[in-house]
Interface confidence: low
């Protein structure tokens, strides 16, 4: 806000004002202030604002006060010469009060020539019949941005969903550099992508690394003078491989006797990515197995023919037991029983079309 200092008579200098040799200037200030009609203290409509000198470009400081019979700048407690002021005055139609505005130009040389611990500053002083009012101090500084970052981000290899911190301390500068982060040349907006967070001290945090966060990250520092880029930090989000489930055991690879069964798994759940570790352990497991050999059945030799029966036939038989089929071996081909006609003893074969009954003897 404005600092109000009431002055009467010719006491227009503050305690911190240094006397000026510039008598010509001070003769311009009123010796006394008329007391009638009563007037309010000057009020600043616009106060001078801090300014930065970029390269060799001078800056303008500006202020406006009402009511004001006089308005001048002083810089570093010294009055600025009247001829260095650009002054304009008008009457405010609403209030009928005089509005005065003034501007001065400050060069780089003026700022550089100031010795002492304090920065170059200027303030406006406005007079009315009621006294004087001083504006706030407006500091004028030479703007710069050093080339070297105080800390640059460091590349990292991180596993999926891990938190990542990329540090950045921008180069020293006036005004203090603003920092933004680039991901592959695109500006990171944490409001748009909530997985990114930029800390108050300019570090970038990736809350949970995603595969899409594999990228080149650059810290960018900028102020009114320049824009500087840090070295690029490569973040690689890797995925360690994981095994799939085992397949079912295969059938024994030997049809007969000793062999093995196997089952397999693959490093695809997930597959390793971006240099992630390959799965540790076996991709194939084998176990011994024994398959019983198949035995094909074979016939025994035929039995003796039976005695001739009542039907005038006799028969003989054989068994599929020499050996019997086992473990999926083939069964015997052919007949178990064989029969044929016979006429032994009292058996008489009837003629094909005869109605004779056969006679049997004992």
């Amino acid at each position: 806000g404005s600092h109000h200092h009431h002055h009467h008579g010719s006491d227009y200098k503050d305690d911190d004002d240094k006397g000026s040799q510039d008598d010509e200037f001070f003769h311009e200030l009123p010796e006394t202030f008329p007391s009638d009609p009563p007037e309010p203290l000057p009020h600043f409509l616009i106060e001078p604002e801090e300014a930065y000198i970029v390269k060799n470009k001078p800056v303008n400081l500006y202020c406006k006060a009402s009511p004001a019979t006089q308005i001048y700048f002083k810089c570093n407690s010294e009055w600025v010469h009247q001829k260095d002021h650009v002054v304009d005055e008008r009457v405010d139609e609403t209030s009928g009060l005089i509005v005065r505005e003034v501007s001065i130009e400050i060069s780089r040389q003026q700022v550089e020539e100031l010795f002492g611990p304090e920065d170059y500053w200027c303030q406006c002083v406005a007079w009315s019949s009621a006294g004087t009012t001083k504006s706030r101090k407006a500091y004028v500084r030479i703007a710069y941005l050093r080339k070297t970052f105080e800390q640059e981000p460091l590349g990292k290899e991180v596993s999926l969903e891990q938190e990542v911190l990329l540090q950045c301390r921008p180069p020293e500068g006036i005004p203090v550099a603003e920092v933004e982060w680039l991901k592959n040349e695109d500006i990171i907006d944490p409001a748009e992508d909530r997985n990114f967070y930029i800390t108050i001290d300019h570090n970038l945090i990736i809350k949970q690394a995603r595969l899409s966060d594999t990228a080149n990250y650059t810290c960018v520092a900028k102020n009114i003078v320049a824009k500087r880029k840090s070295t690029t930090a490569t973040v690689i989000v890797y995925v360690n491989g994981g095994w799939s489930t085992w397949t079912e055991w295969s059938v024994c690879n030997s049809r007969c006797g000793r062999g093995y069964q196997k089952r397999t798994r693959t490093c695809t759940n997930p597959a390793p990515l971006n240099g992630g570790a390959f799965c540790e352990g076996q991709s194939v497991q084998k176990i011994a197995c024994t398959t019983l050999c198949p035995v094909d059945g074979r016939w025994t030799s035929w039995s003796k023919w039976s005695t001739c029966g009542t039907e005038c036939t006799h028969w003989r038989r054989r068994e599929c037991t020499a050996p019997a089929p086992k473990n999926g071996g083939k069964d015997c081909d052919g007949l178990v029983l064989q029969s044929k006609n016979c006429t032994d003893g009292l058996c008489m074969q009837a003629a094909p079309d005869s109605d004779d009954v056969a006679l049997y003897g004992s």
Epitope: G155, K156, E157
Partner: antibody, heavy 119, light 107 residues
Framework: QVQLQESGPGLVKPSETLSLTCTVS????????WSWIRQPPGKGLEWIGY???????NYNPSLKSRVTISVDTSKNQFSLKLSSVTAADTAVYYC?????????????WGQGTLVTVSS | DIQMTQSPSSLSASVGDRVTITCRAS??????LNWYQQKPGKAPKLLIY???SLQSGVPSRFSGSGSGTDFTLTISSLQPEDFATYYC?????????FGGGTKVEIK
């Protein structure tokens, strides 16, 4: 098998510049982060800085104003220069390889060379 | 800078003992922690990287654990060749920093 070998003068006068070279054999200097680390007699380890074959460097802020690390890929070498040395810079200087992007760790080290700063 | 604090600074143990060394970071470093062994007159040797991964060729009696700020190196059964100084090192951010070391001596 990767091997690193430091070389350079063992005695440097105060205010002069310490210069050391690390020769990498059994592997390429391409990729990896090549660091210098020092250890004052009877004390702990201090990282000085690293260089990548691309030329990217990163220095310990406590030494930054005095340190330069450079790389010569054609000779498979990287070098350290430390200016304006004092007795406090007396140490065994190691070169080491940082594996991975920069997550390091230092998986191969030189055997170290003692540099004494004395007039 | 991230400070790494090791404890104890030294310890005495016998062959066959189980030995535990701790390392604390001044801020969270996720799993970016490595352990080294150094014998007098020799360069450090990598034992464990990324907090718990055993470096190739290192005996399985060495193991590492921890995440965030607190980490542990354990030697399950101390062998004569294990008497040395052990250092932790963070690689979460530059400057890369080491712990002050833990000297393991014969009791």
């Amino acid at each position: 098998q990767v091997q690193l070998q430091e070389s350079g003068p063992g005695l440097v006068k105060p205010s002069e510049t310490l210069s050391l070279t690390c020769t990498v054999s059994g592997g390429s200097i391409s990729s990896y982060f090549w660091s210098w680390i020092r250890q004052p007699p009877g004390k702990g380890l201090e990282w000085i800085g690293y260089i990548h074959n691309s030329g990217t460097t990163n220095y310990n802020p406590s030494l930054k104003s005095r340190v330069t690390i450079s790389v010569d890929t054609s000779k498979n070498q990287f070098s350290l220069k430390l200016s304006s040395v004092t007795a406090a810079d007396t140490a065994v200087y190691y070169c080491a390889r940082g594996r991975g992007m920069a997550t390091l760790p230092f998986d191969y080290w030189g055997q170290g060379t003692l540099v004494t700063v004395s007039s | 800078d991230i400070q790494m604090t090791q404890s104890p600074s030294s310890l005495s143990a016998s062959v066959g003992d189980r030995v535990t060394i701790t390392c604390r970071a001044s801020q969270s470093i996720s799993s970016y922690l490595n352990w080294y062994q150094q014998k007098p007159g020799k360069a450090p040797k990598l034992l464990i990287y990324a907090a718990s991964s055993l470096q190739s060729g290192v005996p399985s009696r060495f193991s590492g654990s921890g995440s965030g700020t607190d980490f542990t190196l354990t030697i399950s059964s101390l062998q004569p060749e294990d008497f040395a100084t052990y250092y932790c090192q963070q690689s979460y951010s530059t400057p890369l920093t080491f712990g002050g070391g833990t000297k393991v001596e014969i009791k």
